[in-house]
């Protein structure tokens, strides 16, 4: 199809080489109130279309995205770029930053219901650049946390080095929906609830003498509880002795509860004490068996192929640790009578 009638939007993605960040393009097809665009090539101002333009009666998930190769080849279906670029509803997600994402992206309705819809398309020219270190040393992260129940704020990474006074007007989106009341480079949240979690996008316009660009950044906002003040506790084993049968295989499970920590480095391991000696045992990987907002339960098993007489003289110790401290629970094996 002919893309010369598409409206054009220029976007700039300045990515940090330090962090793993993503980027999005929205298919900003004209809405009924902007219908002059879809119809501008077809109708004089006096003519009235017999139906609303495409976007008037359909939802935005029904769009098709294309990539325009720089060498002038025909348009390519964006699905060819899977899994580096993924379409979800009207949004195109770029999973890996890089200048190779620079180029032209076109979106248009999947269903062309009338001749008027042919020109209903948007061409987005995306320029991708690595961030220069000099531009801002303390720019806001693309992953930000909000503490549940407290006040907090979400900063636009590309503007976080500017004061509120000198900051341009910002357009914010949350999970693809426009947040019409927010216009500053920072969203202030009076009290943080779980629903504040989501993918936020901030846009502002940057102009030079030749043209203007929309500078865009994506922020993943997580709602979290405060870091735990407690060391982990061992839920199992509870008893310090365990009845066993000699010659039989045995699995002893250690289950521990770790409170939430932003930087989470849980330790759970088994070691054996035999008189004055003690050594760590190589056991299967630990696994998370339950995860909630406040804590996580992690399990690690020690497996004995068969219980020997020597095992009865040993102590099997489960050791768990977080940044606050550690806890141990030892188990002595006792022959079943």
């Amino acid at each position: 199809f002919n893309i010369s009638g598409c409206s054009t939007k220029k976007l700039l993605w300045t990515y940090s080489t330090r962090s793993e960040e993503e980027f999005v393009l929205f298919c900003d097809l004209p809405e009924p109130q902007k219908s002059h665009f879809c119809h501008r090539n077809r109708l004089s101002p006096k003519q009235v279309p017999e139906h609303l333009p495409f976007m008037g009666s359909n939802d935005l998930s029904d769009v098709q995205w294309y990539q325009q190769p720089s060498n002038g080849d025909p348009l390519e279906d964006i699905r060819k770029s899977y899994p580096h670029i993924i379409q979800d509803k009207c949004t195109l997600h770029f999973l890996t930053p890089g200048v190779n994402n620079s180029g032209s992206y076109i979106c248009r309705p999947k269903m062309i219901k009338s001749p008027y819809d042919v020109a209903c398309c948007v061409k987005m020219i995306l320029e991708v650049k690595p961030q220069t270190n000099a531009s801002c040393e303390y720019s806001a992260s693309h992953k930000q946390d909000l503490l549940l129940g407290s006040t907090g704020s979400i900063s636009c990474p590309s503007l976080s080095c500017q004061s509120d006074a000198q900051s341009p007007a910002v357009t914010w989106y949350k999970n693809g929906k426009l947040l019409s009341v927010e216009r500053s480079n920072r969203i202030v949240v009076d009290e943080v609830y779980d629903y504040h979690q989501g993918t936020y996008v901030c846009d502002y316009t940057q102009s030079d003498t030749v043209s203007s660009w929309t500078v865009r950044a994506v922020v993943q906002v997580r709602t979290i509880v405060g870091d735990t003040k407690l060391k982990p506790d061992i839920l199992d084993p509870v008893e310090d002795t365990l009845e066993v049968e000699l010659g039989k295989p045995l699995t002893i499970s250690c289950k521990a509860r770790f409170g939430f920590e932003r930087v989470f480095n849980p330790v759970i391991k088994w070691y054996i004490k035999d008189s004055d000696l003690e050594w760590e045992v190589s056991v299967p990987e630990a696994k998370s068996i339950k995860s909630t907002l406040k804590d996580e339960i992690i399990e690690r098993n020690i497996i004995l192929e068969k219980v020997t007489q020597r095992d009865l003289r040993r102590k099997f110790v489960c050791f768990v640790q977080n940044s606050i401290g550690n806890t141990t629970q030892s188990v002595q094996l006792k022959e079943k009578r």
Epitope: P83, I86, D88, H93, L95, T199, Q220, T223
Partner: nanobody, 117 residues
Framework: QLQLVESGGGLVQAGGSLRLSCAAS?????????MGWYRQAPGKQRELVAS???????NYVDSVKGRATISRDNAKKTVYLQMNSLKPEDTAVYYC??????????LGQGTLVTVSS
């Protein structure tokens, strides 16, 4: 923290079918994410096999197109992968994960799928 738990793996004969399930622990996170199924065959890199957006749009890697169907149930916080006409080269550990969203990079423990010829 987001926990993802897969199930449904196992041993199946070539030409057979399997349905993998993945349950997430938090709904507020789940519904706005692009969820996906990854797989890792022995000695190979992990690859994204299929993904599904919050609006239901799906994508598949070429090797499973026409044989795999990914679906989701936001109310149950669950994502599924139906695999038909299985081939020995589909043998791998299959992981459910967040492809796009707040917990991007979160993966489950994995479920082993073995296809015997």
């Amino acid at each position: 923290q987001l926990q993802l738990v897969e199930s449904g793996g196992g041993l199946v004969q070539a030409g057979g079918s399997l349905r993998l399930s993945c349950a997430a622990s938090r709904s507020i996170t789940f519904s706005h994410n692009v969820m996906g199924w990854y797989r890792q065959a022995p000695g190979k890199q992990r690859e994204l096999v299929a993904s599904i957006g919050s609006g239901g749009s799906t994508n598949y890697v070429d090797s499973v197109k026409g044989r795999a169907t990914i679906s989701r149930d936001n109310a149950k916080k669950t994502v599924y992968l139906q695999m038909n006409s299985l081939k020995p080269e589909d043998t791998a550990v299959y992981y459910c994960g967040v492809v796009v969203g707040v917990y991007r990079g979160s993966l489950g423990q994995g479920t082993l799928v073995t296809v015997s010829s």
